[in-house]
């Protein structure tokens, strides 16, 4: 009897009520593997979720988040509010990155600017709330025999535009 069920392909289930005949999954259900005793209920993408891939008899629906939100967790199990670049999401909503930190995405947290001097490098482009610092070649005083005229500016001064 077990062998009969193992013959049931994906998209069907082994119907015990019908002498283990392979029956198609009912509407809004699926089985992604063969030999299933039941079909699983299709996921419904509602509210902040939107359908990325419709449910079929052999595969579950896949959800995305509506505009202004992004997926979190395996298989987009949650939607989290987007913020702007240069911000991070806190309990009180979206807040600008503090001085010395940046976020170049609509999600995630603000991260500290790269400290170029830790690697003995100069600053080519200053950091902003939206962008990390860009480091460049080692300045003269850190590179024997090298030559520069003006030392690199500090990473960024408040109110200054990006370098």
């Amino acid at each position: 009897l077990q062998d009969l069920c193992s013959n049931c392909p994906a998209g069907t289930f082994c119907d015990n009520n019908r002498s283990q005949i392979c029956s198609p999954c009912p509407p809004n259900s699926f089985s992604s593997a063969g030999g299933q005793r039941t079909c699983d209920i299709c996921r419904q993408c509602k509210g902040v979720f939107k359908t990325r891939k419709e449910c079929s008899s052999t595969s579950n629906a896949e959800c995305d988040c509506i505009s202004g939100y992004h997926c979190l967790g395996a298989e987009c199990s949650m939607c989290e509010q987007d913020c702007k670049q240069g911000q991070e999401l806190t309990k009180k909503g979206c807040k600008d990155c503090c001085f010395g930190t940046f976020n170049d995405q609509k999600r995630g947290i603000c991260r500290p600017w790269t400290n170029c001097s830790l690697d003995g490098k100069s600053v080519l482009v200053n950091g902003t709330k939206e962008r990390d610092v860009v480091c460049g070649p080692s300045p003269a005083d850190l590179s024997p025999g090298a030559s520069s005229a003006t030392p690199p500016a500090p990473a960024r001064e408040p109110g200054h535009s990006p370098q």
């Epitope: 080692s138 590179s143 090298a146 690199p152 990006p162 370098q163």
Partner: antibody
Framework: EVHLLESGGGLVQPGGSLRLSCAAS????????MGWVRQAPGKGLEWVSI????????YYADSVKGRFTISRDNSKNTLYLQMNSLRAEDTAVYYC???????????????WGQGTLVTVSS | DIQMTQSPSSLSASIGDRVAITCRAS??????LAWFQQKPGKAPKSLIY???SLQSGVPSKFSGSGSGTDFTLTISSLQPEDFATYYC?????????FGGGTKVEIK
């Protein structure tokens, strides 16, 4: 598409001055360091100077230090090279170039302008 | 200053040949090395940065390798448009320095 157009080259006498300009378009000018590289006739490439995105950091080759000044006007998307006390050995094609970076590090040149010829001769 | 020594200074090759150009730094520069191609009367064009990363739009027949002091630019199958002069540049430290160039000519 990034476009860099140099101007201001020409013939100048030894000891004279010249100011080169480089008009930039096709990218966020203030977000990139910029530089000048020169090439004497029939010779190789020689780095001249670099300026950071906001203009706060400047670096020069020893051969031009104290004579050349690099600057930029981010509101006009323009890079400059003021050249004073010019010498015969400064004769070269001067290229303006955007400084490339990947991730958080950079320092190579990409792309380059078409160049402007500076001839220092009496 | 970091000296960049390219070899050979010139080479003759045929269409379809595999060509390798080497660049040696006088001190370690990690992978802070770029390669450029220059054709007569034209501005240099960036091919490779970070020793081995292909610049956007550059054909994959160009490849770069190396780290520290020894670097190589390889053209897997030379085509007529590849006959040019090639330069390396270190951007590990100021002053930025270029190799003396390698002229690739038709045999």
């Amino acid at each position: 598409e990034v476009h860099l157009l140099e101007s201001g080259g020409g013939l100048v006498q030894p000891g004279g001055s010249l100011r080169l300009s480089c008009a930039a378009s096709g990218f966020t000018f203030s977000s990139y360091a910029m530089g000048w590289v020169r090439q004497a006739p029939g010779k190789g490439l020689e780095w001249v100077s670099i300026i950071g995105g906001g203009g706060g950091s400047t670096y020069y080759a020893d051969s031009v230090k104290g004579r050349f000044t690099i600057s930029r006007d981010n509101s006009k998307n323009t890079l400059y090279l003021q050249m004073n006390s010019l010498r015969a050995e400064d004769t070269a094609v001067y290229y303006c170039a955007k400084v490339g970076y990947s991730g958080t590090y950079g320092g190579w040149f990409d792309p380059w302008g078409q160049g402007t010829l500076v001839t220092v001769s009496s | 200053d970091i000296q960049m020594t390219q070899s050979p200074s010139s080479l003759s090759a045929s269409i379809g040949d595999r060509v390798a150009i080497t660049c040696r730094a006088s001190q370690g520069i990690s992978n802070y090395l770029a390669w450029f191609q220059q054709k007569p009367g034209k501005a240099p064009k960036s091919l490779i940065y970070a020793a081995s990363s292909l610049q956007s739009g550059v054909p994959s027949k160009f490849s770069g390798s190396g780290s520290g002091t020894d670097f190589t630019l390889t053209i897997s199958s030379l085509q007529p448009e590849d006959f040019a002069t090639y330069y390396c540049q270190q951007y590990n430290s100021y002053p930025l320095t270029f190799g003396g160039g390698t002229k690739v000519e038709i045999k």
